[in-house]
C-alpha cells in the first residue's frame, strides 16, 4: 500500500539535491583556497540535518545553526552587494569586480542558489514531489527559513557603504515584500553602515527617466533615513556598458554617464 504523502503547492526538491550540494561544496572549496579546510561531507550532513525528518512548515533558524557554524567565512564588510529581482546582473558584476560579494558568492549562498528542498515529518526521505509554497502553504519552510537566516546575517555583517542593485523595469523597483525589503534593509546596523547606495538598473535602451525619483525608491530612502543610515541613488542607464566599464575602466567611453 503506498504511503500517504502530503501534497504541497510548490515544486518538489531539486532532483539530485544531495549530489548537487556536495558537488557545489567541493567546487567552491577548490576555487576559494581560504575555504580548503571545509569538510564538505560535514557540510552536507549539517544541511540535511536542518530539514530531514522535520515537518516542512515548522523549520526554525536554529535548525540551520550547525550549518552556519561550518560556513564561517571572511567577507569584507565594506564590499557587500545586495540585490533585488536582478540576480543575474549582480552576479555578473561580482564576477568582474572580484573584491565585491553577493550572498551567492559566499559558500552558503553558493550551495543553495536556485535550489529547492524539503523533507517529511518522521521519515528520513527527501520530498521530490512537492514542497511548501511560501504564500499558499507556510512561510516557515526549509528554503524560506534558510534564505531569511543567511540574508539577515549577511546584512548584519555589512559596514561602511553598502550597495544594492534594483531592477528598474519592475513596477515596484523597491518591493517591501522582497528579501531585500523585508529582511536585509531592517538588519543593516546603523552603527556600522554609513550609507546605502542604490543602483537602479534600466531595462529599455531609450529609457532616460530618473528612476531614483520613483515613489518606491523614495519609500526606501524614508525607511533607511529613519534608521539613521544615509541614502544615495544612481541610475544605471546602460547595464551592458556598465559591465563593460567595470571590466575596462580606462576605456574612453567610460567617463560619460552609464
Amino acid at each position: 500500500v503506498p504511503r500517504w504523502r502530503q501534497q504541497w503547492s510548490g515544486p518538489g526538491t531539486t532532483k539530485r539535491f544531495p549530489e548537487t550540494v556536495l558537488a557545489r561544496c567541493v567546487k567552491y572549496t577548490e576555487i576559494h583556497p581560504e575555504m580548503r579546510h571545509v569538510d564538505c561531507q560535514s557540510v552536507w550532513d549539517a544541511f540535511k540535518g536542518a530539514f530531514i525528518s522535520k515537518h516542512p512548515c515548522n523549520i526554525t533558524e536554529e535548525d540551520y545553526q550547525p550549518l552556519m557554524k561550518l560556513g564561517t567565512q571572511t567577507v569584507p564588510c565594506n564590499k557587500i552587494l545586495l540585490w533585488s529581482r536582478i540576480k543575474d546582473l549582480a552576479h555578473q558584476f561580482t564576477q568582474v569586480q572580484r573584491d565585491m560579494f553577493t550572498l551567492e558568492d559566499t559558500l552558503l549562498g553558493y550551495l543553495a542558489d536556485d535550489l529547492t528542498w524539503c523533507g517529511e515529518f518522521n521519515t528520513s526521505k527527501i520530498n521530490y514531489q512537492s514542497c511548501p509554497d511560501w504564500r499558499k502553504d507556510c512561510s516557515n519552510n526549509p528554503v524560506s527559513v534558510f534564505w531569511k537566516t543567511v540574508s539577515r546575517r549577511f546584512a548584519e555583517a555589512a559596514c561602511d557603504v553598502v550597495h544594492v542593485m534594483l531592477n528598474g523595469s519592475r513596477s515596484k523597483i523597491f518591493d517591501k515584500n522582497s528579501t531585500f525589503g523585508s529582511v536585509e534593509v531592517h538588519n543593516l546596523q546603523p552603527e556600522k553602515v554609513q550609507t546605502l547606495e542604490a543602483w537602479v538598473i534600466h531595462g529599455g535602451r531609450e529609457d532616460s527617466r530618473d528612476l531614483c525619483q520613483d515613489p518606491t525608491i523614495k519609500e526606501l530612502e524614508s525607511i533607511i533615513s529613519k534608521r539613521n543610515i544615509q541614502f544615495s541613488c544612481k541610475n544605471i542607464y546602460r547595464p551592458d556598458k556598465f559591465l563593460q566599464c567595470v571590466k575596462n575602466p580606462e576605456d574612453s567611453s567610460c567617463t560619460s554617464e552609464i
Epitope: 552556519m68 560556513g71 559566499t106 546575517r153 556600522k192
Partner: nanobody, 117 residues
Framework: EVQVLESGGGLVQPGGSLRLSCAAS????????MSWVRQAPGKGLEWVSG????????DYADSVKGRFTISRDNSKNTLYLQMNSLRVEDTAVYYC??????????RGQGTLVTVSS
C-alpha cells in the same frame, strides 16, 4: 567605527589554560552579539564561540565544547574567552568579532595562542 583589541594569547603547554580578552569600542557593545573565531596556520577561519548581547545565551563549536567558556562584561565593553585543557590543535590566531556569523570581517589584529610542549 567598530574597533576591537584582542589580548591574552601566548605560549602554553598542552592541558594548560589561557584567558583571552577583547576590548571593544565605537559601537553600543551591549546591543551586539559577539563571537570568537580563529585561524590556524595555513587553515581557514573557524568559528569558536558566540554570545548574545546580554550574555544570556552562549554557543560553542563542538571542538571546544566543555573546555572553553565565553563571557562578557558590558560595563567594561569587554569580551572574554576562558580556554582550559588546551590542545596542540587549538594553536591559532584568535579574533573577536561582532555578530554570530557565518560572515565575519574581523577588525582587530588578533592574539596568537600557541599550544606546544
Amino acid at each position: 567605527e567598530v574597533q576591537v583589541l584582542e589580548s591574552g594569547g601566548g605560549l602554553v603547554q598542552p592541558g594548560g589554560s589561557l584567558r583571552l580578552s577583547c576590548a571593544a569600542s565605537g559601537f553600543t557593545f551591549s546591543s551586539y552579539a559577539m563571537s570568537w573565531v580563529r585561524q590556524a596556520p595555513g587553515k581557514g577561519l573557524e568559528w569558536v564561540s558566540g554570545i548574545s548581547g546580554s550574555g544570556g545565551t552562549t554557543d560553542y563549536a563542538d571542538s571546544v565544547k566543555g573546555r572553553f567558556t565565553i563571557s562578557r562584561d558590558n560595563s567594561k565593553n569587554t569580551l572574554y574567552l576562558q580556554m582550559n585543557s588546551l590542545r596542540v590543535e587549538d594553536t591559532a590566531v584568535y579574533y573577536c568579532a561582532d555578530g554570530t556569523g557565518p560572515f565575519f570581517d574581523y577588525r582587530g589584529q588578533g592574539t596568537l595562542v600557541t599550544v606546544s610542549s
